[in-house]
């Protein structure tokens, strides 16, 4: 898919990797929270 206009911002280039890592970390935390919630509901 086409890159959004913000990809032209130098910041996008310099922080691309760390932002992707931060997002992955956030998703992992969300998944962990969801699992915990399912465990509680499942009981």
């Amino acid at each position: 898919s086409e890159e959004p206009p913000i990809s032209l911002d130098l910041t996008f280039h310099l922080l691309r990797e760390v932002l992707e890592m931060a997002r992955a970390e956030q998703l992992a935390q969300q998944a962990h929270s969801n699992r915990k919630l399912m465990e509680i509901i499942g009981k």
Partner: antibody
Framework: EVQLQQSGPELVKPGASVKMSCKAS????????MKWVKQSHGESLEWIGV????????FYNQKFKGKATLTVDKSSSTAFMQLNSLTSEDSAVYSC???????????WGQGTLVAVSA | DVLMTQTPLSLPVSLGDQASISCRSG???????????LEWYLQRPGQSPRLLIY???NRFSGVPDRFSGSGSGTDFTLKISRVGAEDLGIYYC?????????FGGGTKLEVK
């Protein structure tokens, strides 16, 4: 003309929180990241963090994790920064800034003075 | 964190003279993409910082050609030929090659 208009000065008590704003105009708000910078009185500049107005992705300078919270409101082209558990060390001028395809801090807001005092 | 050290702390000049400000980084600030993200800013009294130079030696739009940046690796210089009253203030170098991004401590350009 690119303009970043920041909210007015704040006098707050230790332990309290403060939320300041930065209203962008003269460009498409979602086309550029918004950064925040701290300048303590008579001292140098410190980069706090950056937010992508498109999707809310945020990256903080480790030093300011837990101290600053960055958000945006796309409908009003406004970026916000909240500072919590304030101490005298947080007394400073806080500025928002925007980059370009070539540089990181090409356009600056006028700054918001935060004074923490009992 | 990459420490950016500026010298001198204060630089008294006569208007019309040339001024030279040094900035040294604690480690190389060549980015993995080959570029060096070294920028220079001027903060006039009571104002917000203003971008002068990006990527070591490129003048930002509207910046007069009396401002020039040079250097590589860890050593960088900002030169101002024919200093005018509007050039007085605090100059900061900045690196965006390594996270966290960091600024130098500043050099105050003032009238002798």
């Amino acid at each position: 003309e690119v303009q970043l208009q920041q909210s007015g000065p704040e006098l707050v008590k230790p332990g309290a929180s403060v939320k300041m704003s930065c209203k962008a105009s003269g460009y498409t708000f979602t086309d550029y990241f918004m950064k925040w910078v701290k300048q303590s009185h008579g001292e140098s500049l410190e980069w706090i963090g950056v937010i992508n107005p498109n999707n809310g992705d945020i990256f903080y300078n480790q030093k300011f994790k837990g101290k600053a919270t960055l958000t945006v409101d796309k409908s009003s082209s406004t970026a916000f920064m909240q500072l919590n558990s304030l101490t005298s060390e947080d007394s400073a001028v806080y500025s928002c800034a925007r980059g370009t395809d070539r540089a990181l801090f090409a356009y600056w807001g006028q700054g918001t003075l935060v004074a923490v005092s009992a | 964190d990459v420490l950016m050290t500026q010298t001198p702390l204060s630089l008294p000049v006569s208007l019309g003279d040339q001024a030279s400000i040094s900035c040294r980084s604690g480690q190389s600030i060549v980015h993995s993409d080959g570029n060096t993200y070294l920028e220079w800013y001027l903060q006039r009294p009571g104002q917000s910082p203003r971008l002068l130079i990006y990527k070591v030696s490129n003048r930002f739009s509207g910046v007069p050609d009396r401002f020039s940046g040079s250097g590589s690796g860890t050593d960088f210089t900002l030169k101002i030929s024919r200093v005018g009253a509007e050039d007085l203030g605090i100059y900061y170098c900045f690196q965006g090659s390594h996270i966290p991004w960091t600024f130098g401590g500043g050099t105050k350009l003032e009238v002798k």
